[in-house]
């Protein structure tokens, strides 16, 4: 009685059970009653990541530096290439298929995580005590200065975009 | 045992088509695959293109809008056709038969004895 | 395409001596998945047909003398016949069959000095 199901790695065509292609290799022939699959591997810029029967390998993901892109890690033939952004970029998404410019955090807001090749930059409001005065996607938020460790006093306050402004204590 | 002949004219005219037969016995085309293969006099070996036992074929890209490879089963022949000839492509024309070695491993482990085509008007 | 290369064009070695001829290719050809290297080597005579004489860079095809033996892996692979016997003088050749378009190498012609 023919097979309704195989076992893994195989595949069933024509009520047969033939094995799959390894990762790498595509199908050039099923499997008969006599012979085996026969497969092949994939060419140079090809890949297949896993047991197949696929008649094609697929292209390798091209990392184009129009959009931004750089080859992150090279594809082999059975793994596809990965794509990061360019210095300064980030990916627009998971696939990574292009790349935008990193935020800057606002005078006022300080860069909480350095973005990376796949993540923006993430900001934060200055709490009370700091301030960031520049747009900038790498400055954190700085403390304000500390006019009492100067011998000076505090002359205006600081704010979230201003640092305090010291200045010499009334002398009586 | 195992044996393949290759058959056509040995002159064809520049920008006509030439068209060869591999007649084999010994084995059965629906069993193993045919390549065919060329050699230019004094040169050395260009695979043209394989038809796999399945049917499927595979070209060499430099000829592959040129190049068509078909399959007689029941007649145990593959045929060649190679259209737009010119003086390049004057050379022995041999079919073989392809051995599959497990592991997506390919090679053509029986040659037929060639066929010299010469390409002139 | 892979391009091979092979080195030298023709040699000259004694009878008895052993013959070396190299191969190289434009890529390579381990499969990282099964780690297998996708070369044959063809021995051709004047006036014949090449003849297969290893596939997978080392194993001998059925009937080919063990004085012939292949090795190598990625783009360096070399044929040696151990001792040169009169009956080995022929052109032979290189062939990855990585993937299509399957190509040879340009031959290296093997005579007797």
């Known amino acids: 009685e023919p097979p309704t199901a195989c076992r893994e790695k195989q595949y069933l065509i024509n009520s047969q059970c033939c094995s799959l292609c390894q990762p790498g290799q595509k199908l050039v022939s099923d499997c008969t009653e006599f012979t085996e699959t026969e497969c092949l591997p994939c060419g140079e810029s090809e890949f297949l990541d896993t047991w197949n029967r696929e008649t094609h390998c697929h292209q390798h993901k091209y990392c184009d530096p129009n959009l931004g892109l750089r080859v992150q890690q090279k594809g082999t033939s059975e793994t596809d290439t990965i794509c990061t952004c360019e210095e300064g970029w980030h990916c627009t998404s998971e696939a990574c298929e292009s790349c935008v410019l990193h935020r800057s955090c606002s005078p006022g807001f300080g860069v909480k995580q350095i973005a990376t090749g796949v993540s923006d930059t993430i900001c934060e409001p200055c709490p009370v005590g700091f301030f960031s005065n520049v747009s900038s996607a790498f400055e954190k938020c700085h403390p304000w200065t500390s006019c009492e460790t100067k011998d000076l006093v505090v002359q205006q306050a600081g704010t979230n975009k201003t640092d305090v402004v010291c200045g010499p204590q009334d002398r009586l | 045992q195992v044996q393949l002949q290759e058959s056509g004219p040995g002159l064809v005219k520049p920008s006509e088509t030439l068209s060869l037969t591999c007649t084999v016995s010994g084995f059965s085309l629906t069993t193993y695959g045919l390549h065919w293969i060329r050699q230019p006099p004094g040169k050395g070996l260009e695979w043209i293109g394989v038809?796999?036992?399945?049917?499927?074929?595979d070209y060499n890209p430099s000829l592959k809008s040129r190049v068509t490879i078909s399959k007689d089963t029941s007649k145990n022949q593959v045929s060649l056709k190679l259209s737009s000839v010119t003086a390049a492509d004057t050379a022995v024309y041999y079919c073989a038969k392809n051995s599959y070695y497990g592991d997506g491993g390919h090679a053509m482990d029986y040659w037929g004895q060639g066929t010299l085509v010469t390409v002139s008007s | 395409d892979i391009v091979m290369t092979q080195s030298p064009d023709s040699l000259a070695v004694s009878l008895g001596e052993r013959a070396t001829i190299n191969c190289k290719s434009s890529q390579s050809l381990l499969h990282s998945f099964n780690q297998k290297n996708y070369l044959a080597w063809y021995q051709q005579k004047p006036g014949q047909p090449p003849k297969l004489l290893i596939y997978f860079t080392s194993t001998r095809e059925s009937g080919v003398p063990d004085r012939f033996s292949g090795s190598g892996s990625g783009t360096d692979f070399t044929l040696t016949i151990s001792s040169l016997q009169a009956e080995d003088v022929a052109v032979y050749y290189c062939q990855q069959h990585y993937t299509t378009p399957f190509t040879f190498g340009q031959g290296t012609k093997l005579e007797i000095k």
């Open positions: 038809i796999w036992r399945g049917g499927n074929t």
